[in-house]
Amino acid sequence: ILWHEMWHEGLEEASRLYFGERNVKGMFEVLEPLHAMMERGPQTLKETSFNQAYGRDLMEAQEWCRKYMKSGNVKDLTQAWDLYYHVFRRISKHHHHHH
Protein backbone atom coordinates (compact mmCIF):
# COMPACT_ATOMS: atom_id res chain seq x y z
CA ILE A 1 0.00 0.00 0.00
CA LEU A 2 1.27 3.49 -0.83
CA TRP A 3 2.27 5.79 2.02
CA HIS A 4 -0.30 8.43 1.14
CA GLU A 5 -3.05 5.79 1.27
CA MET A 6 -1.78 4.47 4.61
CA TRP A 7 -1.65 7.96 6.09
CA HIS A 8 -5.06 8.89 4.67
CA GLU A 9 -6.63 5.77 6.19
CA GLY A 10 -4.65 6.21 9.42
CA LEU A 11 -5.72 9.81 9.90
CA GLU A 12 -9.35 8.84 9.15
CA GLU A 13 -9.20 6.22 11.89
CA ALA A 14 -7.32 8.55 14.25
CA SER A 15 -10.00 11.21 13.76
CA ARG A 16 -12.72 8.60 14.46
CA LEU A 17 -10.99 7.61 17.68
CA TYR A 18 -10.36 11.16 18.83
CA PHE A 19 -13.42 13.09 17.61
CA GLY A 20 -15.83 10.15 17.68
CA GLU A 21 -14.80 7.92 20.57
CA ARG A 22 -12.72 10.48 22.53
CA ASN A 23 -10.06 7.78 22.78
CA VAL A 24 -6.66 9.51 22.81
CA LYS A 25 -4.79 6.31 23.64
CA GLY A 26 -6.37 4.54 20.64
CA MET A 27 -5.53 7.49 18.44
CA PHE A 28 -1.85 7.25 19.38
CA GLU A 29 -1.88 3.47 18.80
CA VAL A 30 -3.06 4.07 15.22
CA LEU A 31 -0.54 6.82 14.49
CA GLU A 32 2.55 5.28 16.14
CA PRO A 33 3.21 2.56 13.49
CA LEU A 34 2.77 5.17 10.74
CA HIS A 35 5.35 7.42 12.37
CA ALA A 36 7.65 4.39 12.84
CA MET A 37 7.31 3.64 9.13
CA MET A 38 8.40 7.22 8.36
CA GLU A 39 11.37 6.91 10.73
CA ARG A 40 12.58 3.80 8.88
CA GLY A 41 12.89 5.98 5.82
CA PRO A 42 11.66 5.83 2.22
CA GLN A 43 12.42 2.76 0.10
CA THR A 44 10.95 3.88 -3.24
CA LEU A 45 10.73 7.04 -5.31
CA LYS A 46 7.06 7.49 -4.37
CA GLU A 47 7.91 7.17 -0.68
CA THR A 48 10.74 9.67 -1.11
CA SER A 49 8.32 12.07 -2.78
CA PHE A 50 5.80 11.62 0.06
CA ASN A 51 8.53 12.15 2.65
CA GLN A 52 9.62 15.37 0.98
CA ALA A 53 6.03 16.65 0.82
CA TYR A 54 4.77 15.65 4.27
CA GLY A 55 7.70 14.34 6.33
CA ARG A 56 8.48 17.58 8.16
CA ASP A 57 4.85 18.26 9.17
CA LEU A 58 4.34 14.68 10.32
CA MET A 59 7.57 14.71 12.33
CA GLU A 60 6.53 17.97 13.99
CA ALA A 61 3.07 16.53 14.73
CA GLN A 62 4.73 13.52 16.36
CA GLU A 63 6.82 15.85 18.54
CA TRP A 64 3.65 17.63 19.72
CA CYS A 65 2.09 14.23 20.52
CA ARG A 66 5.15 13.29 22.57
CA LYS A 67 4.99 16.63 24.38
CA TYR A 68 1.31 16.01 25.12
CA MET A 69 2.04 12.54 26.52
CA LYS A 70 4.56 14.09 28.92
CA SER A 71 2.68 17.27 29.79
CA GLY A 72 -1.00 16.35 29.47
CA ASN A 73 -1.40 19.88 28.08
CA VAL A 74 -4.28 19.82 25.59
CA LYS A 75 -2.73 22.72 23.69
CA ASP A 76 0.07 20.36 22.61
CA LEU A 77 -2.52 17.97 21.19
CA THR A 78 -4.27 20.76 19.27
CA GLN A 79 -0.91 21.71 17.73
CA ALA A 80 -0.49 18.11 16.60
CA TRP A 81 -3.99 18.00 15.11
CA ASP A 82 -3.42 21.29 13.28
CA LEU A 83 -0.55 19.57 11.48
CA TYR A 84 -2.37 16.27 10.91
CA TYR A 85 -5.34 18.18 9.49
CA HIS A 86 -3.06 20.18 7.19
CA VAL A 87 -1.47 16.95 5.92
CA PHE A 88 -4.85 15.23 5.56
CA ARG A 89 -6.24 18.06 3.46
CA ARG A 90 -3.18 18.13 1.23
CA ILE A 91 -3.19 14.34 0.74
CA SER A 92 -6.94 14.43 0.00
CA LYS A 93 -6.56 17.22 -2.58
CA HIS A 94 -3.56 15.60 -4.23
CA HIS A 95 -5.15 12.14 -4.24
CA HIS A 96 -8.46 13.48 -5.62
CA HIS A 97 -6.62 15.46 -8.30
CA HIS A 98 -4.85 12.34 -9.56
CA HIS A 99 -7.93 10.09 -9.62
Partner: antibody, heavy 123, light 107 residues
Framework: EVQLVESGGGLVQPGGSLRLSCAAS????????IHWVRQAPGKGLEWVAS????????SYADSVKGRFTISADTSKNTAYLQMNSLRAEDTAVYYC????????????????WGQGTLVTVSS | DIQMTQSPSSLSASVGDRVTITCRAS??????VAWYQQKPGKAPKLLIY???SLYSGVPSRFSGSRSGTDFTLTISSLQPEDFATYYC?????????FGQGTKVEIK
Amino acid sequence: EVQLVESGGGLVQPGGSLRLSCAASGFNFSSSYIHWVRQAPGKGLEWVASISSSSSSTSYADSVKGRFTISADTSKNTAYLQMNSLRAEDTAVYYCARYVYSYSQGGPAFDYWGQGTLVTVSS
Amino acid sequence: DIQMTQSPSSLSASVGDRVTITCRASQSVSSAVAWYQQKPGKAPKLLIYSASSLYSGVPSRFSGSRSGTDFTLTISSLQPEDFATYYCQQSWSVPITFGQGTKVEIK
Protein backbone atom coordinates in the same frame (compact mmCIF):
# COMPACT_ATOMS: atom_id res chain seq x y z
CA GLU B 1 -31.48 9.88 1.49
CA VAL B 2 -30.38 10.40 5.10
CA GLN B 3 -33.30 10.92 7.47
CA LEU B 4 -33.66 11.31 11.22
CA VAL B 5 -37.14 11.39 12.73
CA GLU B 6 -37.72 12.16 16.41
CA SER B 7 -40.80 11.19 18.38
CA GLY B 8 -41.95 10.84 21.97
CA GLY B 9 -42.15 14.47 23.03
CA GLY B 10 -45.06 15.91 24.97
CA LEU B 11 -46.24 17.48 28.20
CA VAL B 12 -44.93 15.96 31.43
CA GLN B 13 -45.04 17.02 35.08
CA PRO B 14 -41.87 17.94 37.01
CA GLY B 15 -40.24 14.78 38.32
CA GLY B 16 -41.79 12.74 35.50
CA SER B 17 -40.20 10.65 32.76
CA LEU B 18 -40.27 10.57 28.98
CA ARG B 19 -38.49 8.51 26.31
CA LEU B 20 -37.59 10.13 23.02
CA SER B 21 -36.87 8.07 19.90
CA CYS B 22 -34.78 8.93 16.85
CA ALA B 23 -35.45 6.69 13.85
CA ALA B 24 -32.60 6.76 11.34
CA SER B 25 -32.54 5.74 7.69
CA GLY B 26 -30.41 6.22 4.60
CA PHE B 27 -27.01 5.51 6.19
CA ASN B 28 -25.08 2.84 8.08
CA PHE B 29 -26.52 3.38 11.55
CA SER B 30 -24.45 0.62 13.20
CA SER B 31 -21.19 2.51 12.66
CA SER B 32 -22.51 6.00 13.32
CA TYR B 33 -22.58 8.57 16.11
CA ILE B 34 -25.89 10.01 17.24
CA HIS B 35 -26.18 13.06 19.48
CA TRP B 36 -29.08 14.85 21.12
CA VAL B 37 -29.11 18.64 21.10
CA ARG B 38 -31.85 20.74 22.68
CA GLN B 39 -33.13 24.26 22.30
CA ALA B 40 -35.21 25.95 24.99
CA PRO B 41 -37.92 28.32 23.66
CA GLY B 42 -36.29 31.45 22.25
CA LYS B 43 -32.81 30.28 23.31
CA GLY B 44 -29.68 28.84 21.71
CA LEU B 45 -28.51 25.28 21.08
CA GLU B 46 -27.31 23.07 23.94
CA TRP B 47 -25.60 19.72 23.49
CA VAL B 48 -27.18 17.00 25.66
CA ALA B 49 -25.69 13.54 25.00
CA SER B 50 -23.97 11.29 22.48
CA ILE B 51 -23.63 7.61 21.65
CA SER B 52 -21.42 5.54 19.37
CA SER B 53 -23.65 2.87 17.83
CA SER B 54 -20.70 0.51 17.37
CA SER B 55 -18.99 0.78 20.77
CA SER B 56 -21.99 2.02 22.80
CA SER B 57 -19.71 4.61 24.42
CA THR B 58 -21.73 7.54 25.74
CA SER B 59 -21.20 11.12 26.95
CA TYR B 60 -23.52 13.53 28.75
CA ALA B 61 -23.78 17.21 29.56
CA ASP B 62 -23.39 17.90 33.28
CA SER B 63 -26.90 19.37 33.34
CA VAL B 64 -28.47 15.96 32.51
CA LYS B 65 -25.92 13.49 33.91
CA GLY B 66 -27.56 10.93 36.18
CA ARG B 67 -31.06 11.80 34.91
CA PHE B 68 -30.89 11.11 31.17
CA THR B 69 -29.72 7.92 29.45
CA ILE B 70 -28.86 7.64 25.77
CA SER B 71 -29.01 4.26 24.03
CA ALA B 72 -29.18 2.76 20.56
CA ASP B 73 -30.80 -0.32 19.05
CA THR B 74 -28.90 -1.17 15.86
CA SER B 75 -31.50 -3.78 14.86
CA LYS B 76 -34.11 -1.00 14.72
CA ASN B 77 -31.79 1.78 13.49
CA THR B 78 -33.07 3.86 16.39
CA ALA B 79 -31.48 5.93 19.14
CA TYR B 80 -33.27 6.76 22.38
CA LEU B 81 -33.09 9.37 25.09
CA GLN B 82 -34.61 8.24 28.37
CA MET B 83 -35.33 11.33 30.46
CA ASN B 84 -36.07 10.91 34.17
CA SER B 85 -36.55 13.39 37.05
CA LEU B 86 -37.56 16.04 34.54
CA ARG B 87 -37.37 19.71 35.53
CA ALA B 88 -38.95 22.87 34.14
CA GLU B 89 -35.54 23.85 32.72
CA ASP B 90 -35.57 20.72 30.53
CA THR B 91 -38.40 22.25 28.49
CA ALA B 92 -37.07 22.46 24.93
CA VAL B 93 -37.22 21.16 21.39
CA TYR B 94 -35.00 18.06 21.32
CA TYR B 95 -33.13 17.30 18.10
CA CYS B 96 -31.22 14.16 17.26
CA ALA B 97 -28.32 14.73 14.91
CA ARG B 98 -25.82 12.57 13.08
CA TYR B 99 -22.26 13.43 14.05
CA VAL B 100 -19.49 12.88 11.53
CA TYR B 101 -15.95 12.75 12.89
CA SER B 102 -13.95 12.69 9.69
CA TYR B 103 -12.56 15.59 7.69
CA SER B 104 -13.37 13.76 4.45
CA GLN B 105 -17.02 13.25 5.48
CA GLY B 106 -17.61 16.88 6.46
CA GLY B 107 -16.67 16.78 10.10
CA PRO B 108 -16.22 16.89 12.93
CA ALA B 109 -19.76 18.32 12.82
CA PHE B 110 -23.48 17.53 12.82
CA ASP B 111 -24.32 17.01 9.17
CA TYR B 112 -27.94 15.83 9.45
CA TRP B 113 -30.62 16.81 11.97
CA GLY B 114 -34.12 15.61 12.69
CA GLN B 115 -37.09 17.98 12.72
CA GLY B 116 -37.17 18.06 16.52
CA THR B 117 -39.70 17.03 19.15
CA LEU B 118 -41.03 19.39 21.84
CA VAL B 119 -40.77 18.42 25.49
CA THR B 120 -42.71 20.60 27.94
CA VAL B 121 -42.17 20.11 31.67
CA SER B 122 -44.92 21.86 33.60
CA SER B 123 -47.42 21.25 36.36
CA ASP C 1 -15.74 23.39 29.42
CA ILE C 2 -14.80 25.35 26.31
CA GLN C 3 -16.76 28.58 25.91
CA MET C 4 -17.57 29.77 22.40
CA THR C 5 -18.15 33.52 22.57
CA GLN C 6 -20.06 34.65 19.50
CA SER C 7 -20.52 38.23 18.36
CA PRO C 8 -22.53 40.19 17.57
CA SER C 9 -25.70 38.70 19.12
CA SER C 10 -27.73 40.35 16.35
CA LEU C 11 -27.15 42.53 13.32
CA SER C 12 -29.22 44.35 10.72
CA ALA C 13 -28.11 44.19 7.11
CA SER C 14 -29.40 44.71 3.60
CA VAL C 15 -29.46 42.35 0.63
CA GLY C 16 -26.03 42.49 -1.04
CA ASP C 17 -24.17 43.41 2.16
CA ARG C 18 -21.05 41.60 3.32
CA VAL C 19 -21.69 40.11 6.76
CA THR C 20 -19.10 38.87 9.24
CA ILE C 21 -19.81 36.90 12.42
CA THR C 22 -17.05 35.95 14.83
CA CYS C 23 -16.59 33.27 17.46
CA ARG C 24 -13.79 33.09 20.01
CA ALA C 25 -12.95 29.80 21.74
CA SER C 26 -11.86 30.03 25.38
CA GLN C 27 -9.00 27.63 24.62
CA SER C 28 -7.37 26.01 21.62
CA VAL C 29 -9.77 23.80 19.61
CA SER C 30 -7.59 23.21 16.53
CA SER C 31 -9.86 23.53 13.46
CA ALA C 32 -12.73 21.57 15.01
CA VAL C 33 -15.31 24.33 14.55
CA ALA C 34 -18.50 24.23 12.50
CA TRP C 35 -21.06 26.88 11.57
CA TYR C 36 -24.83 26.35 11.25
CA GLN C 37 -27.78 28.33 9.93
CA GLN C 38 -31.16 28.05 11.63
CA LYS C 39 -34.50 29.46 10.53
CA PRO C 40 -37.50 29.79 12.89
CA GLY C 41 -39.19 26.46 13.61
CA LYS C 42 -36.56 24.51 11.65
CA ALA C 43 -33.54 22.39 12.53
CA PRO C 44 -30.05 23.87 12.10
CA LYS C 45 -28.23 23.27 8.81
CA LEU C 46 -24.50 22.72 8.48
CA LEU C 47 -22.69 25.42 6.46
CA ILE C 48 -18.99 25.16 7.32
CA TYR C 49 -16.97 22.36 8.93
CA SER C 50 -13.35 22.16 10.07
CA ALA C 51 -13.31 25.97 10.39
CA SER C 52 -13.05 26.72 6.68
CA SER C 53 -14.46 23.87 4.57
CA LEU C 54 -17.71 24.55 2.73
CA TYR C 55 -20.25 21.78 3.27
CA SER C 56 -21.70 20.11 0.19
CA GLY C 57 -24.54 22.05 -1.43
CA VAL C 58 -23.90 25.28 0.49
CA PRO C 59 -23.61 28.41 -1.70
CA SER C 60 -20.08 29.73 -2.18
CA ARG C 61 -21.02 33.14 -0.73
CA PHE C 62 -20.53 31.47 2.67
CA SER C 63 -16.96 31.07 3.89
CA GLY C 64 -15.17 30.36 7.13
CA SER C 65 -11.73 31.21 8.43
CA ARG C 66 -9.59 30.71 11.49
CA SER C 67 -6.90 32.70 13.24
CA GLY C 68 -5.74 30.86 16.35
CA THR C 69 -8.81 30.60 18.57
CA ASP C 70 -10.80 33.18 16.57
CA PHE C 71 -13.23 31.86 13.96
CA THR C 72 -15.14 33.86 11.39
CA LEU C 73 -18.16 33.18 9.21
CA THR C 74 -18.51 35.52 6.23
CA ILE C 75 -21.44 35.94 3.87
CA SER C 76 -19.97 37.81 0.90
CA SER C 77 -23.26 39.10 -0.49
CA LEU C 78 -26.32 38.64 1.69
CA GLN C 79 -29.33 37.10 -0.05
CA PRO C 80 -33.00 37.25 1.09
CA GLU C 81 -32.88 33.58 2.14
CA ASP C 82 -29.87 34.22 4.41
CA PHE C 83 -31.85 36.08 7.07
CA ALA C 84 -31.62 33.59 9.93
CA THR C 85 -29.74 32.80 13.13
CA TYR C 86 -26.17 31.49 12.89
CA TYR C 87 -24.32 29.36 15.44
CA CYS C 88 -20.70 28.29 15.80
CA GLN C 89 -19.88 25.01 17.52
CA GLN C 90 -16.71 23.28 18.71
CA SER C 91 -16.16 19.51 18.55
CA TRP C 92 -12.66 19.51 20.03
CA SER C 93 -13.76 18.34 23.46
CA VAL C 94 -16.78 17.08 25.36
CA PRO C 95 -19.02 18.74 26.28
CA ILE C 96 -19.54 19.96 22.73
CA THR C 97 -20.45 23.65 22.98
CA PHE C 98 -22.19 26.21 20.80
CA GLY C 99 -21.93 29.96 20.52
CA GLN C 100 -24.92 31.99 21.74
CA GLY C 101 -26.08 32.65 18.18
CA THR C 102 -26.21 35.68 15.86
CA LYS C 103 -29.56 36.78 14.46
CA VAL C 104 -29.21 38.37 11.03
CA GLU C 105 -32.19 40.65 10.42
CA ILE C 106 -33.33 42.81 7.51
CA LYS C 107 -32.35 46.47 7.84
